[in-house]
């Protein structure tokens, strides 16, 4: 039990996308504000989002410190104007959030193609590596750099005028497709992480069709 | 435990219609690729189509394009096979299969089978 | 469609054996092979995946290479349980294929 008007926070749920990580709760303040708190399993505590009434607080700077370490945090509760108040035991209340870990849980963001090229029956479709917040040696890590062939990229691949998905995949940025001569093509693709159990699949990205301005077109 | 459970199969006239089921336990469909799978009696396999249950996505054999539909149910976690204008040459059993959607796109984990028989 | 051409379409052995099957795709693809048991009615169950790799609780006496659009199967000493039929599959590109399947049957 805390002080009179605090009440714990609840809720707890871990938001991560492409290691973008926000730790969301509940309820709404009244009278009281927040303070998170987040450690590795070994490690000591931290303290984020300082007496904040928001009900959010975005720890990526904590988690991209190493994305394969397992994360736990807690959001305390205070009273309004009367921060340094605890509860009957001396301690303020706080409720704990599940286990996170990053690198198998952040959810995969939309891919982009980033470009397609025909050269005769060959298409060459690029997806865009999307730049994350993890850093080595200060710079930004690609999505790549960071899950290597852990992730891979499925194509779906249609003639304009058919409606069956052919598929194709890899563990690079690119693929290399055999593609009907005269016949313009559409692509969608879906970015995957074959070992994992949940949060396998990104969504699908914008469909890009051939005779669009991202594709080249060149006849040998 | 991962488990694909066919139903459905049967004795059906040829140009009539059936509804094969695979229910899967064990795992999220959506978060896989479901394939049918046929086996004539005492022929090899032959694969029949593929659904992405998270966004309907699919593609058949040519020998069944146009007759065959598969859909899935993701809040039942079940794929379908609807076949029509079935003909002798699609007696077989039929099997579903997961795609673990790796690189090399293994199959790795079947159902038993369900036994469709085309005969007048 | 690629081809997946596979021989012998049946063999004898004995267990203790060492059985090599092969299977020659049509085109390129890649490392995208697998290897299925199968044994009469029942599902076809995964031995082998990208080519050479031992799929779970797999016996090691089972091995797959590749060499180009060549892959092979192994079986270094066979065991009672392994009589069965073995089929390749290609999936590089749509539609997967198989290869039309290896009988072994005990000498």
């Known amino acids: 039990s805390g002080t009179t008007n605090t009440v714990a926070a609840y809720n707890l749920t871990w938001k991560s996308t492409n290691f973008k990580t926000i730790l969301e709760w509940e309820p709404k303040p009244v009278n009281q504000v927040y303070t998170v708190q987040i450690s590795t399993k070994s490690g000591d505590w931290k303290s984020k989002c300082f007496y904040t009434t928001d009900t959010e607080c975005d720890l990526t700077d904590e988690i991209v410190k190493d994305v394969k370490q397992t994360y736990l945090a807690r959001v305390f509760s205070y009273p309004a104007g009367n921060v340094e108040s605890t509860g009957s035991a001396g301690e303020p209340l706080y409720e704990n959030s599940p286990e996170f870990t990053p690198y198998l849980e952040t959810n995969l963001g939309q891919p982009t193609i980033q470009s397609f090229e025909q050269v005769g029956t060959k298409v060459n479709v690029t997806v865009e590596d999307e730049r994350t917040l993890v850093r080595r040696n200060n710079t930004f890590l690609s999505l790549r750099d960071v899950f290597g062939k852990d992730l891979i990229y499925t194509l779906y691949y249609w003639k304009s005028s058919s409606s069956g998905k052919k598929t194709a995949k890899t563990n690079t940025n690119e693929f290399l497709i055999d593609v009907d001569k005269g016949e313009n093509y559409c692509f969608s693709v879906q970015a995957v992480i074959p070992s994992r159990t949940v949060n396998r699949k990104s969504t699908d990205s914008p469909v890009e069709c051939m005779g669009q301005e991202k594709g080249e077109f060149r006849e040998i | 435990e991962v488990q694909l459970v066919e139903s459905g199969g049967g004795l059906v006239q040829p140009g009539g219609s059936l509804r094969l089921s695979c229910a899967a336990s064990g795992f999220t469909i959506s978060y896989y690729i479901i394939h049918w799978v046929r086996q004539a009696p005492g022929k090899g396999l032959e694969w029949v189509g593929y659904?992405?249950?998270?966004?309907?996505?699919?593609y058949y054999a040519d020998s069944v394009k146009g007759r065959f539909t598969i859909s899935a149910d993701t809040s039942k976690n079940t794929a379908y096979l609807q076949m029509n204008s079935l003909r002798a040459e699609d007696t077989a059993v039929y099997y579903c299969a997961r795609d673990v959607q790796s690189v090399s796109g293994e199959f790795d984990y079947w159902g038993q089978g369900t036994l469709v028989t085309v005969s007048s | 469609d690629i081809q997946m051409t596979q021989s012998p379409s049946s063999l004898s052995a004995s267990v203790g054996d060492r059985v090599t099957i092969t299977c020659r795709a049509s085109q390129d693809v890649n490392t995208a092979v697998a290897w299925y048991q199968q044994k009469p009615g029942k599902a076809p169950k995964l031995l082998i995946y990208s080519a050479s790799f031992l799929y779970s609780g797999v016996p090691s006496r089972f091995s797959g290479s590749r060499s180009g659009t060549d892959f092979t199967l192994t079986i270094s000493s066979l065991q009672p349980e392994d009589f069965a039929t073995y089929y390749c599959q290609q999936h590089y590109t749509t539609p997967p294929t198989f290869g039309q399947g290896t009988k072994v049957e005990i000498k």
């Open positions: 659904i992405d249950p998270s966004n309907g996505y699919t």
